[in-house]
């Protein structure tokens, strides 16, 4: 049928709760391709009504909430004029009691599962919550082993519970819960973080700051070679991921195939009171899908963006 | 059950450079810490780095000029390379990695050890 | 660096002993990390967070210490204890070993 196929990471989801994953792929950033989702190679389209429990929302499939027998493969199809990607997700299903103190942690939970505290310092876990934008999401609510987190140590902030002078006890199992509400329902979110802490230098609280970019726009042609650098300070012996992402994903698994797009390989030079890092972003060959597309610098909580722009034409060629 | 096993030759020449292998089985090393560290013979156990799961190495100072640690993900392995190796390099070289009671400094996973003699 | 000096280097003793190793460190350290080795095996994980034993550690032995002093101790020496014993400072890099201390069959 002429697509090609991708298999994303087996994901490991709890039952009984709202779920949703994007379908992200390029030339998914431009206005002409459609998007459809399946199930286990079914010819019949996930529904795009609002009222079924599984339904896609733009480029999203949503469950409101998932099932144990959600459990599958699920296919979304991305068709533009000249190209089509299929891209397979294996969904797993688990039951979960996040209460129950005789499991400690599960096996294979994704990275934003398992979370780093670091001992003596200022640090934060954070609540990935990942729904399309019919999705509203309440206040954030923080437990650990199944009470709720109070003290002055606990703040939060937006998505993230901050935690000052990390100690040894902070290790365990936490859960974040919100209330997600859609179409006029309400539906509870409870992710469990399994928190471990570590004594190794973390960032001491300190935000990378990103030298450049700045949010900015970049002029340049289309079918040129283009490579930005990202420069960024943070502390010695921080533990901060430097990376590019476009679409909330790395250049290097977004472009995967094509490999048009590609982030090089980090440097750094030492400082007397901090690093300065570099890691570019190349463009083998500007295209037209990636105008107009913000691509990230990431580094640890802090991030900037570039976005490529056509040059004004010049008219002193005609 | 985290596995670890180190992989590589025995036997590497003076001024070379030693590379190992350590693939991780029963867990994903884009979480965590994941270590490199000696024990030269007769003698005591040496830190030599680690890669964090975000990428960040960190290196002994001792060995920074020398050492370098890498990783594939898709793999699920990571690497150590040691470079201008002496006599002074021949060591039993283990990867490890803890996360035991949720605490990742705890170095509860090792590797069985692969022993690397810097000989001509 | 922070030098960890375990002492003593070796020591013979005789089942059933009380036997005390103890490591100092050059400064304060927030934690202590105890590994036993046996010849020709990996590093076991046997005391972390200075008085937490890792699974499968006999409850006759124990840890303790603060600040620059901390102990490993066997109340009743049995003959599987027979080892090289390690502390590990993780507060401050370069993350140090102790040089081992040498337990022997008297």
């Known amino acids: 049928d002429g697509c090609n196929d991708i298999f994303m990471k087996n994901e490991m989801l709890s039952a009984s709760q709202p779920f949703a994953f994007n379908c992200t792929f390029p030339p998914i950033t431009s206005g002409e391709v459609s998007v459809t989702w399946y199930k286990n190679s079914s010819k019949i389209p996930v529904s795009k009504i609002i009222q079924s429990r599984i339904h896609q929302d733009e480029t999203w499939i949503l469950f409101l909430p998932m099932e144990w027998g959600d459990s599958g493969v699920y296919q979304c199809v991305i068709k533009g004029r000249d190209s089509c990607h299929r891209i397979h997700v294996n969904l797993t299903v688990f039951e979960k009691q996040w209460c129950d103190t005789s499991v400690k942690g599960l096996p294979n939970l994704s990275d934003e599962y398992k979370q780093i505290l670091h001992l003596g310092k200022d640090d934060s876990l954070t609540c990935h919550l990942h729904f399309p934008k019919s999705c509203i999401l309440g206040p954030i609510k923080w437990y650990k082993d199944c009470n709720e987190i109070t003290g002055e140590r606990f703040t939060v902030l937006e998505t993230r519970l901050l935690v000052s002078n990390v100690s040894a006890e902070d290790r365990g199992n936490y859960a974040c819960q919100v209330i997600l509400t859609h179409s006029g329902k309400q539906y509870e979110v409870l992710n469990g973080i399994t928190v471990s802490i570590t004594e190794r230098a973390g960032y001491g609280g300190s935000v990378p700051k990103i030298i450049y970019p700045k949010n900015n726009s970049i002029e340049v042609q289309l079918g040129t070679t283009l490579i930005v650098d990202c420069n960024i300070t943070d502390t010695k012996d921080n533990t901060n991921l430097r990376c590019w992402r476009v679409n909330n994903t790395l250049v290097d698994d977004y472009y995967n195939e094509s490999k048009r797009i590609r982030e090089g390989v980090e440097t750094h030079a030492s400082f007397r009171e901090y690093n300065l890092y570099t890691v570019n972003i190349t463009f083998l060959e500007v295209k037209m899908e990636d105008y107009g597309l913000p691509f990230m610098c990431h580094a640890g909580v802090s991030a900037a963006y570039i976005m490529l722009q056509l040059p004004a034409p010049d008219f002193r060629a005609y | 059950q985290v596995q670890l096993q180190e992989s590589g030759p025995g036997l590497v020449k003076p001024s070379q450079t030693l590379s190992l292998t350590c693939t991780v089985s029963?867990?994903?090393?884009?979480?965590g810490y994941w270590n490199w560290i000696r024990n030269h013979p007769g003698k005591g156990l040496e830190y030599i780095?680690?890669?964090?799961?975000?990428?960040?190495?960190y290196y002994n100072p001792s060995l920074k000029s020398r050492v370098t640690i890498s990783r594939d993900t898709s793999k699920n392995q990571y690497y150590l390379k040691l470079s201008s190796v002496t006599a002074a390099d021949t060591a039993v070289y283990y990867c490890?990695?803890?996360?035991?009671?949720?605490?990742?400094?705890?170095?509860?996973?090792w590797g069985q050890g692969t022993l690397v003699t810097v000989s001509s | 660096d922070i030098q960890m000096t375990q002492s003593p280097s070796s020591l013979s003793a005789s089942v059933g002993d009380r036997v005390t190793i103890t490591c100092r460190a050059s400064?304060?350290?927030?934690?202590m990390y105890w590994y036993q080795q046996k010849p020709g095996k990996a590093p076991k994980l046997w005391i972390y967070?200075?008085?937490n034993l890792a699974s499968g550690v006999p409850s006759r032995f124990s840890g303790s210490g603060s600040g620059t002093s901390y102990t490993l101790t066997i109340s009743s020496l049995q003959p599987e204890d027979f080892a090289t014993y390690y502390c590990?400072?993780?507060?401050?890099?370069?993350?140090?070993f102790g040089q081992g201390t040498k337990l022997e069959i008297k």
């Open positions: 490890a990695t803890g996360g035991y009671d949720y605490v990742e400094d705890a170095l509860y996973y």
């Open positions: 029963g867990a994903s090393i884009t979480s």
């Open positions: 780095g680690y890669i964090y799961y975000s990428g960040y190495t």
């Open positions: 400064s304060n350290v927030r934690y």
């Open positions: 967070l200075t008085s």
């Open positions: 590990q400072q993780y507060t401050t890099s370069p993350y140090t």
